[in-house]
């Protein structure tokens, strides 16, 4: 059975290099991939009742997400 990539990292693994334009950070395997391969978040409509999702980085620090809410260039999800 293949082990998941998350099994290979330590809890204190360094943050990855930010993704180049047109790439997004895959939070599962923790590397940059073409944004089209991921379900990057859609923007919340103005005045939506639910709060916008929290991000660990400020928007200007997020890279490679394209339109809408930025995909996070950090290892942190799964």
């Amino acid at each position: 059975m293949r082990r998941g990539p998350r099994s290979l990292r330590g809890r204190d693994a360094p943050a990855p290099t930010p993704c180049v334009p047109a790439e997004c950070f895959d939070l599962l395997v923790r590397h940059c991939v073409a944004c089209g391969l991921l379900r990057t978040p859609r923007p919340k409509p103005a005045g939506a009742s639910s709060p916008a999702p929290r991000t660990a980085l400020q928007p200007q620090e997020s890279v490679g997400a394209g339109a809408g809410e930025a995909a996070l260039p950090l290892p942190g999800l799964l």
């Epitope: 293949r2 998941g4 998350r6 099994s7 809890r11 943050a15 939070l27 599962l28 395997v29 991939v33 089209g36 391969l37 991921l38 379900r39 990057t40 978040p41 709060p51 999702p53 929290r54 660990a56 995909a71 950090l74 290892p75 942190g76 999800l77 799964l78």
Partner: antibody
């Protein structure tokens, strides 16, 4: 909106095999992460495994390599092959799609697998 | 594996009540300042429905009476004013470490 439809459940004898299908519409299975989750009668949820955009798979180690996830991109369908089935594998099997943050936001209706002699 | 323990296992409440369900992880599910905890609602014979992701983010289309909070090992799902359609079973799930694991569920019943 993603829609998922499972099929292939039914009655199988202990030691037998079964292949479940999950047909996806509204998005390509070459994008994102596609999961199987199961629920034994009257019990809680158990994550089975996933296949992602590149065809990479990962499984819950508790299943001890008896289960295999695969896909057919031409049919936009992914599968759960279950071998050496046991009575304790009796469950409703759901397929589900992850959002960017790893939560399962789209689910199929479920298909019941009964392992009994 | 990270063990998820929900409490209570079941509860009886009335329409309009404020309901709180807790979920405790056997170890922290935080990483890089994010809590990898999600909450689902399931009704009999139906698939689960995502309510809250990343501990406190409300899924699109979910009523604002649902909210989530917590970090580290202790998390809470709150229903501010219980509605008839909220009687169901609720599950927490962590996706911080493989294998992903769910709590045993909390059944919310009519008093």
């Amino acid at each position: 909106e993603v829609q998922l439809v499972e099929s292939g459940g039914g009655l199988v004898q202990p030691g037998g095999s079964l292949r479940l299908s999950c047909a996806a519409s509204g998005d390509s299975i070459t994008r994102g992460y596609w999961n199987w989750v199961r629920q034994a009668p009257g019990k809680g949820l158990e994550w089975v495994g996933y296949i992602n955009y590149s065809g990479t798979t990962y499984y819950n180690p508790s299943l001890k390599s008896r289960f295999t996830i695969s896909r057919d991109t031409s049919k936009n369908t992914f599968y759960l092959q279950m071998n050496s089935l046991r009575a304790e594998d009796t469950a409703v099997y759901y397929c589900a799609n992850l959002n960017y943050y790893g939560a399962m936001d789209y689910w199929g209706q479920g298909t019941l697998v009964t392992v009994s002699s | 594996d990270i063990q998820m323990t929900q409490s209570p296992s079941s509860l009886s409440a009335s329409v309009g009540d404020r309901v709180t369900i807790t979920c405790r992880a056997s170890e922290s599910v935080d990483d890089y300042g994010i809590s990898f905890m999600h909450w689902y609602q399931q009704k009999p014979g139906k698939a689960p429905k995502l309510l809250i992701y990343r501990a406190s983010d409300l899924e699109s289309g979910v009523p604002s009476r649902f909210s989530g909070s917590g970090s580290g090992t202790d998390f809470t799902l709150t229903i501010s004013s219980l509605q008839p359609e909220d009687f169901a079973t609720y599950y927490c799930q962590q996706t911080s470490k493989d294998p992903w694991t769910f709590g045993q569920g909390t059944k919310v019943e009519i008093k």
